[in-house]
């Protein structure tokens, strides 16, 4: 697995650097997770032809993956820092069950899948420190998550490959939209 943010050789070699601000740490954390997703997608795409499937064909799945919409306050029109932050944290919390599902889906990138999961937990902590309105954040119900996980793991091989691909693609997109919004805060 890649080295977590702040521990790369560049940082070690430059002790005179200013410590990272909260925003820079969040930015770096998201970029680190995106690197992990990229590596996982590589393995997925090498294993199956899911990556060639059109968005329309893939849209007919029953996964309720978090997605950024204009009403969430993260887009430039109607941008609202607090609403957006709540959406990002809520979305990441909702993705956690899907990241758990990914844990047994990779052979050569098992460590990478774990790194993505753990780094996402750290990112959520960073963002929660930044948020003022923590009461507005709804945490997914553990029982619902457990039954969803069981259901996903019971799918046939083709559907599991499809689910893996969709989770990675949607998570990447959600993180990119989050990264863009957070840099405006």
């Amino acid at each position: 697995a890649p080295v977590p943010p702040g521990e790369d050789s560049k940082d070690v070699a430059a002790p005179h650097r200013q410590p990272l601000t909260s925003s820079e740490r969040i930015d770096k954390q998201i970029r680190y997770i995106l690197d992990g997703i990229s590596a996982l997608r590589k393995e997925t795409c090498n294993k199956s032809n899911m990556c060639e499937s059109s968005k329309e064909a893939l849209a007919e799945n029953n996964l309720n993956l978090p997605k950024m919409a204009e009403k969430d306050g993260c887009f430039q029109s109607g941008f609202n820092e607090e609403t957006c932050l709540v959406k990002i944290i809520t979305g990441l919390l909702e993705f956690e069950v899907y990241l758990e599902y990914l844990q047994n889906r990779f052979e050569s990138s098992e460590e990478q899948a774990r790194a993505v999961q753990m780094s996402t937990k750290v990112l959520i902590q960073f963002l929660q420190k930044k948020a003022k309105n923590l009461d507005a954040i709804t945490t997914p119900d553990p029982t619902t998550n457990a039954s969803l996980l069981t259901k996903l793991q019971a799918q046939n091989q083709w559907l599991q490959d499809m689910t893996t691909h969709l989770i990675l693609r949607s998570f990447k997109e959600f993180l990119q939209s989050s990264l863009r919004a957070l840099r405006q805060m």
Partner: antibody, heavy 122, light 107 residues
Framework: QVTLKESGPTLVKPTQTLTLTCTFS??????????VGWIRQPPGKALEWLAL???????HYSPSLKSRLTITKDTSKNQVVLTMTNMDPVDTATYYC??????????????WGQGTLVTVSS | DIVMTQSPATLSVTPGDRVSLSCRAS??????LHWYQQKSHESPRLLIK???QSISGIPSRFSGSGSGSDFTLSINSVEPEDVGVYYC?????????FGAGTKLELK
């Protein structure tokens, strides 16, 4: 390979609305991380960023021109359209469309069109 | 808005010279800094992305360095075809902003 091409009028009258179309190929504006934007350059002057539209339809505008600009995309036609209202002679410039594509959303403009010179005069 | 200040405005060089072009951001933009070259009557082209990342097809004599708010574009041995205007760009946050450019000319 990636190409972008601007089209639209070369001459517009003051107060009129300018509509420019960017037609591109070699990439899709439905791919996450992709954005297409507009930049202009008055004769002999520096580059000025105008607007950018993302794969997910988020739109960003230059604050000084926001009230006059609208950017839209037609993913199926591989086109991005910029409209600029209430044109003035100071808007005379070469208008470029360009692409940004990056996992980290660095907003580096890696491919540019050839540009189209728009003159505003009565 | 993040203001990008480039210096010098004009640089007169002799082929073979090593030159440095400076770009300063009005606030920290981390590594979200890009360099473009624009030759006379041509569209700009991306030279360096994210401070120091090289771009396919760009000669290796071009390199970038810096971090935070101070950045440098270096040309290690200027060729006559390098004549043109060089722009730096803030890619951190909106509005995206360009510097006023540094004009590179031959003595």
């Amino acid at each position: 390979q990636v190409t972008l091409k601007e089209s639209g009028p070369t001459l517009v009258k003051p107060t009129q609305t300018l509509t420019l179309t960017c037609t591109f190929s070699g990439f899709s504006l439905s791919t996450s991380g992709v954005a297409v934007g507009w930049i202009r350059q008055p004769p002999g002057k520096a580059l000025e960023w105008l607007a950018l539209i993302f794969w997910d339809d988020d739109k960003h505008y230059s604050p000084s021109l926001k009230s006059r600009l609208t950017i839209t995309k037609d993913t199926s036609k591989n086109q991005v359209v910029l409209t600029m209202t209430n044109m003035d002679p100071v808007d005379t410039a070469t208008y470029y469309c360009a692409r940004s594509y990056d996992d980290y959303l660095y907003y580096a403009l890696d491919y540019w069109g050839q540009g189209t010179l728009v003159t505003v005069s009565s | 808005d993040i203001v990008m200040t480039q210096s010098p405005a004009t640089l007169s060089v002799t082929p073979g010279d090593r030159v440095s072009l400076s770009c300063r951001a009005s606030q920290s933009i981390s590594d979200y800094l890009h360099w473009y070259q624009q030759k006379s009557h041509e569209s700009p082209r991306l030279l360096i992305k994210s401070v120091s990342q090289s771009i396919s097809g760009i000669p290796s004599r071009f390199s970038g360095s810096g971090s935070g708010s101070d950045f440098t574009l270096s040309i290690n041995s200027v060729e006559p075809e390098d004549v043109g205007v060089y722009y730096c760009q803030n890619g951190h946050s909106f509005p995206l902003t360009f510097g006023a450019g540094t004009k590179l000319e031959l003595k």
